[in-house]
């Protein structure tokens, strides 16, 4: 066959859909690979062709669009399942072509089963709510385009297995679920079940997302360096191991990059010749505030090393801070005979 621009298997778009529910899948070519949309392609005389490879098979085969009740159909750049079956799992390819042009991309489609409590292998989107931040809403995701605006679906919300009704601070409002005041105890999986009629049949769309309650921007502060501090002096003799922890607290900030680093005499440890190692550990609070500890270690410290400046730096979207560690050489205790001699005025 003639050459075709093959974008390969687009595993970034691992599409998961529930068994026995409608699914509408847009050809990824127009969303991620080509610089024009379906309407432009169609009016230029290009045709969109769909085919698939079943799970654990190598054979590409056409999609059967002549199933009873049009179970699988294509509408513009969308492949429709009304509804899906478990054995629809496989790699689907959409190809755009005419006599002179060809472009195609494949993507995996996985039809997954759920239990009565909506547990499944589905990867769940995470929605972060700010703690105690006033009314916040989550919206039932990915239901656009399934039914016209004239159709009024029924929506039922669940937390885990339980229908949300008479919850103190969580109120279902159609496609939205309102949290009057988000608390840690609101963490969990929330499911909306959208039920709508179509051509005398009733379909259900199930969408589950994970709610994670995180620190509020109202409480956010610049990084706080707890160690090193002014109360601790790192007093060492040459040959001993020098260990200095830098412990920094970062408020949760959406999309902020938290950084901690050491400088020695104003340089990054990688840029100096001394044998220094840095180990980092990270812990999180219940609201995803972060405490990072970087321990600077010099196995056998020299008297030169004990004269250097060791500074811990931290940066987040809220600001940058730095704190120097107090490092000094231990003064050896005077020898007894010398001390006595000095005491008697000897020089």
């Amino acid at each position: 066959s003639e050459r075709c621009d093959d974008w390969g298997l687009d595993t970034m778009r691992q599409i998961q859909v529930f068994e026995d529910e409608p699914a509408r899948i847009k050809c990824p070519l127009f969303e991620h690979f080509l610089k024009f949309n379906y309407s432009t392609a169609h009016s230029a005389g290009l045709t969109l062709i769909w085919y698939w490879t079943r799970q654990d098979r190598d054979l590409e085969e056409p999609i059967n669009f002549r199933l009873p009740e049009n179970r699988i159909s294509k509408e513009k750049d969308v492949l429709w399942f009304r509804p899906t079956l478990l054995n629809d799992t496989g790699n689907y390819t959409c190809m755009l072509r005419n006599t002179t042009y060809c472009s195609k991309v494949a993507f995996p489609l996985e039809v997954v089963q759920k239990d009565s409590c909506f547990n499944s292998p589905m990867k769940l989107p995470v929605h972060k709510l700010y703690i105690e931040y006033g009314i916040q809403r989550i919206t039932c995701p990915n239901v656009d385009g399934y039914f016209p605006s004239s159709v009024k679906p029924t929506i039922t919300w669940y937390m885990g297995c339980y229908k949300i009704q008479n919850f103190n601070n969580v109120i279902p409002e159609g496609m939205n679920l309102s949290f009057l005041i988000a608390l840690i105890s609101n963490n969990g999986n929330y499911t909306c079940v959208v039920t709508y009629p179509e051509n005398g049949r009733t379909f259900h769309l199930t969408r589950t997302l994970t709610v994670k309650v995180v620190g509020s921007p109202k409480n956010a502060v610049p990084p706080v360096i707890h160690s090193p501090n002014d109360h601790v002096v790192y007093e060492k003799e040459p040959g001993e191991e020098l260990l200095i922890p830098c412990t920094v607290y970062f408020s949760f900030l959406m999309d902020s990059r938290n950084e901690v680093w050491w400088t020695i005499d104003g340089k990054k440890p990688d840029d100096i010749t001394i044998d220094v190692t840095i180990n980092e550990s990270i812990s999180h609070s219940r609201t995803e505030d972060e405490t990072r500890t970087q321990i600077l270690s010099i196995k056998k410290v020299t008297s030169e090393d004990l004269k250097r400046s060791y500074v811990c730096h931290a940066r987040s979207a809220k600001g940058e801070v730095a704190k120097a560690a107090k490092v000094k050489q231990k003064v050896p205790a005077p020898r007894y005979t010398v001390e006595l001699a000095c005491g008697f005025g000897a020089t």
């Epitope: 885990g160 608390l183 963490n187 969990g188 219940r286 405490t291």
Partner: antibody
Amino acid sequence: QVQLLQSGAEVKKPGSSVKVSCRASGGTFSIYAIDWVRQAPGQGLEWMGGIIPISGTENSAQNFQDRITITADKSTNTAYMELSSLRSEDTAVYYCARNGATSDAFDIWGQGTMVTVSS
Amino acid sequence: EIVLTQSPGTLSLSPGERATLSCRASLSVSSNYLAWFQQRPGQAPRLLIYGVSRRATGIPDRFSGSGSGTDFTLTISRLEPEDFAVYYCQQYGSSPLTFGGGTKVEIK
């Protein structure tokens, strides 16, 4: 008005287990976290762990992790804390406490259950 | 683990006096999730203050909380006879949840 009612005092032998119950009355139970806190005689308060009944999410303090089991029965509005391999230093009053409706602080406490571990 | 250190261990005051109790954390308290509890002998603890400075339902306004980060204070503006008890601070923002060792407020 929500109340937390705990089971009665227990006397246990070292090495055995104890299961303390905490029943909520007069309000919604399953959507709030129920935590367990203990207090040895003349000592301060020590958090042991907690559960959110509706999701079954449970977590506990490291020093109890291998000995504690926290469960909840939504049908009876009751939370349970079972502590195994008891030793004399587990002698304490065990409290259950509810996270609040408008905050995550412990706003309602049970009356406490005295557990004595003695041979 | 966040360690909470309360001071003083004991506070001897007379009714009508002002009490200032301190609670210091080894690390910043997440989301200002710091609470104060009162415990009278033979009773369960009672929530006084949550979120550093918010009074719990039914708590008189002579109790107030303040602070941020690692340093927190509970103030009782005028001690009443029923206020003589043990007071605990607690952080509930990071697991494990931890309590301070307590401050006993006793009658002078």
